[in-house]
Interface confidence: medium
C-alpha cells in the first residue's frame, strides 16, 4: 500500500482531484463534495449517487497505488479496509449512498472516488479530503468546483510517494478583516500562491521521477498531470 499522503503533498493531491474526469459512460456516478477540509478527529460525508442498475459501490482512495476503502451492496454486510474499521458509517442505498468517515487522521488525506459496478464500471469525479491539524485549519482551503478532465492519474506502483523536502502547503491567506485596499494584494498573493503550488508540485513530481524508473508510466503520467493542471490556471485544459 502506498504510504499515507502528507499535507506536504497538497499540490499533488489538488492536481489529482482537479485532474480526474467524471463518469464517462451512459450511466454516471454523481459524487459530492468535490473537496472538503476538516480538522483531525472530525468526520466527512461522501455521497455517491447513480441511476440504478448496479451490483454495488466501492470507495477507492487514489494515488500511486489505489486502495479500496469500502464495498457496499444492498442486503450484504459491507466490507471495510482495516484502516477504516470502526470509523465508517453508511446511510441510504447503493443507488444513493452516503459514506461517513469518522475520526479522520492526517494520513487519511487523499482523493477518494466512488466506483459503481455496472456493465461498464463507472467512476465518480473524486472527493479531495484534506485533513489538517486544528491550529492550521485556516491554511488549507479548497473551492468546491467540479473537477476538470485531465491526463491520467498514475497507475498503481509498488512504492509510496517519498516525502518531498522542499514542498509546502498553500500560504496562510491574509485575515478576513484586512482593509479593502488590500484586496489587490490578496488577489496577487493568491495567484502567486497557486503558481508556487504548481511549481512545487512539479518539483515533487520531478523528485519522484528521479527517485523511480524514469521510463515508468507513473513517472510520465504524473508529469503530464501536473503540467496540464498548472496550465489550467491560465488556459483551458488540453484534455477537456
Amino acid at each position: 500500500m502506498a504510504g499515507p499522503p502528507r499535507l506536504l503533498l497538497l499540490p499533488l493531491l489538488l492536481a489529482l482531484a482537479r485532474g480526474l474526469p467524471g463518469a464517462l459512460a451512459a450511466q454516471e456516478v454523481q459524487q459530492s463534495p468535490h473537496c472538503t477540509t476538516v480538522p483531525v478527529g472530525a468526520s466527512v460525508n461522501i455521497t455517491c449517487s447513480t441511476s440504478g442498475g448496479l451490483r454495488g459501490i466501492y470507495l477507492r482512495q487514489l494515488g500511486p497505488q489505489p486502495q479500496d476503502i469500502i464495498y457496499y451492496e444492498d442486503g450484504v454486510v459491507p466490507t471495510t479496509d482495516r484502516r477504516f474499521r470502526g470509523r465508517i458509517d453508511f446511510s441510504g442505498s447503493q443507488d444513493n449512498l452516503t459514506i461517513t468517515m469518522h475520526r479522520l487522521q492526517l494520513s487519511d488525506t487523499g482523493t477518494y472516488t466512488c466506483q459503481a459496478i455496472t456493465e461498464v464500471n463507472v467512476y465518480g469525479s473524486g472527493t479531495l479530503v484534506l485533513v489538517t491539524e486544528e491550529q492550521s485549519q485556516g491554511w488549507h482551503r479548497c473551492s468546491d468546483a467540479p473537477p476538470r478532465a485531465s491526463a491520467l492519474p498514475a497507475p498503481p506502483t509498488g512504492s509510496a510517494l517519498p516525502d518531498p523536502q522542499t514542498a509546502s502547503a498553500l500560504p496562510d491567506p491574509p485575515a478576513a478583516s484586512a482593509l479593502p485596499a488590500a484586496l489587490a494584494v490578496i488577489s496577487f498573493l493568491l495567484g502567486l500562491g497557486l503558481g508556487v503550488a504548481c511549481v512545487l508540485a512539479r518539483t515533487q513530481i520531478k523528485k519522484l521521477c528521479s527517485w523511480r524508473d524514469k521510463n515508468s508510466a507513473a513517472c510520465v503520467v504524473y508529469e503530464d498531470m501536473s503540467h496540464s493542471r498548472c496550465n489550467t490556471l491560465s488556459s483551458p485544459n488540453q484534455y477537456q
Epitope: L24, A25, L152, P156, T157, G158, N215, S216, A217, Y239
Partner: antibody
Framework: SVEESGGRLVTPGTPLTLTCTVS????????MCWVRQAPGKGLEYIGI?????SAYYASWATGRFTISKTSTTVDLKISSPTTEDTATYFC????????????????WGPGTLVTVSS | DIVMTQTPASVSEPVGGTVTIKCQAS??????LSWYQQKPGQPPKLLIY???KLTFGVSSRFRGSGSGTEYTLTISDLECADAATYYC????????????FGGGTEVVVK
C-alpha cells in the same frame, strides 16, 4: 465497441499499420492496449496508449512497435515484421479510474490476423 | 521484467467439479491482477480484476483471490460452457511490469 482492421499477408521487413476503431466512448477518456496471439499460443501484451497520447510498451516490444492515436482510432505500426510477428492482433479498452487499465481490459475487438511470410 | 507463471497448463474436470488455477508473479503486484476467459476464435473476456472483483454479469462461480505474488482463480460447479483457456494478467503500474500475461490454462470439462 472496438474493432481492429489492417491485418493482411506481408513479406518480412514490410512495415504494416493496424487500426483499432472505437465507438461509444472517447479515446480522451480511456486508455487502449494492444495484445497479440500467435496461432495456437497464448496472449502477449504489446503496449498501451493513455488518454494524453503517451504510449508505453512491453520491453520486448520497444522499438519494434509504435502506438499512436487520433480522436477515434488507435494505430499499431509494426516497423519491420518478421515471421515471428504472425499473429492475431487485438486492441482493448482500459478500465479503471480515468480509463487506465489497472482494472483490466474490456471490451476487446474480435482481432485482425497478420501473416508474415516470404 | 515481471514474469507471470500460470499452473497447470491444462486441467480436466467433470461437470459439477471445481478447478483451481494458480498464477505466480515474479515480484509483488499488490493485487493488481486480472483473469480472462478465452474460447477458440473469440477475443478474451474479462472475468475478474483487482485480484478478486467480479466483472458485472460474470457468474459468482468464478472466484479470484490472492495478493502479493500468489493468485488463484477458482471455478466451482463446472459447466460445459466453462471449457476455455484462462489467462492471468498483471495490471501493476510501472511500464516494465505492466500488462504481462500468464501462459494460460486450458480447462476441459468432461
Amino acid at each position: 465497441s472496438v474493432e481492429e482492421s489492417g491485418g493482411r499477408l506481408v513479406t518480412p521487413g514490410t512495415p504494416l499499420t493496424l487500426t483499432c476503431t472505437v465507438s461509444g466512448f472517447s479515446l480522451s477518456s480511456f486508455a487502449m492496449c494492444w495484445v497479440r496471439q500467435a496461432p495456437g499460443k497464448g496472449l502477449e501484451y504489446i503496449g498501451i496508449i493513455n488518454t494524453g497520447g503517451s504510449a508505453y510498451y512491453a520491453s520486448w516490444a520497444t522499438g519494434r512497435f509504435t502506438i499512436s492515436k487520433t480522436s477515434t482510432t488507435v494505430d499499431l505500426k509494426i516497423s519491420s515484421p518478421t515471421t515471428e510477428d504472425t499473429a492475431t492482433y487485438f486492441c482493448a479498452r482500459g478500465n479503471g479510474y480515468a480509463g487506465y487499465g489497472y482494472d483490466g481490459f474490456d471490451p476487446w475487438g474480435p482481432g485482425t490476423l497478420v501473416t508474415v511470410s516470404s | 521484467d515481471i514474469v507471470m507463471t500460470q499452473t497447470p497448463a491444462s486441467v480436466s474436470e467433470p461437470v459439477g467439479g471445481t478447478v483451481t488455477i494458480k498464477c505466480q508473479a515474479s515480484q509483488s503486484i499488490t493485487s493488481w491482477l486480472s483473469w480472462y476467459q478465452q474460447k477458440p476464435g473469440q477475443p478474451p473476456k474479462l472475468l475478474i480484476y483487482a485480484a478478486s472483483k467480479l466483472t458485472f454479469g460474470v457468474s459468482s462461480r468464478f472466484r479470484g483471490s490472492g495478493s502479493g505474488t500468489e493468485y488463484t482463480l477458482t471455478i466451482s460447479d463446472l459447466e460445459c460452457a466453462d471449457a476455455a483457456t484462462y489467462y492471468c494478467q498483471s495490471n501493476y503500474g510501472s511500464s516494465s511490469a505492466y500488462g504481462a500475461f500468464g501462459g494460460g490454462t486450458e480447462v476441459v470439462v468432461k
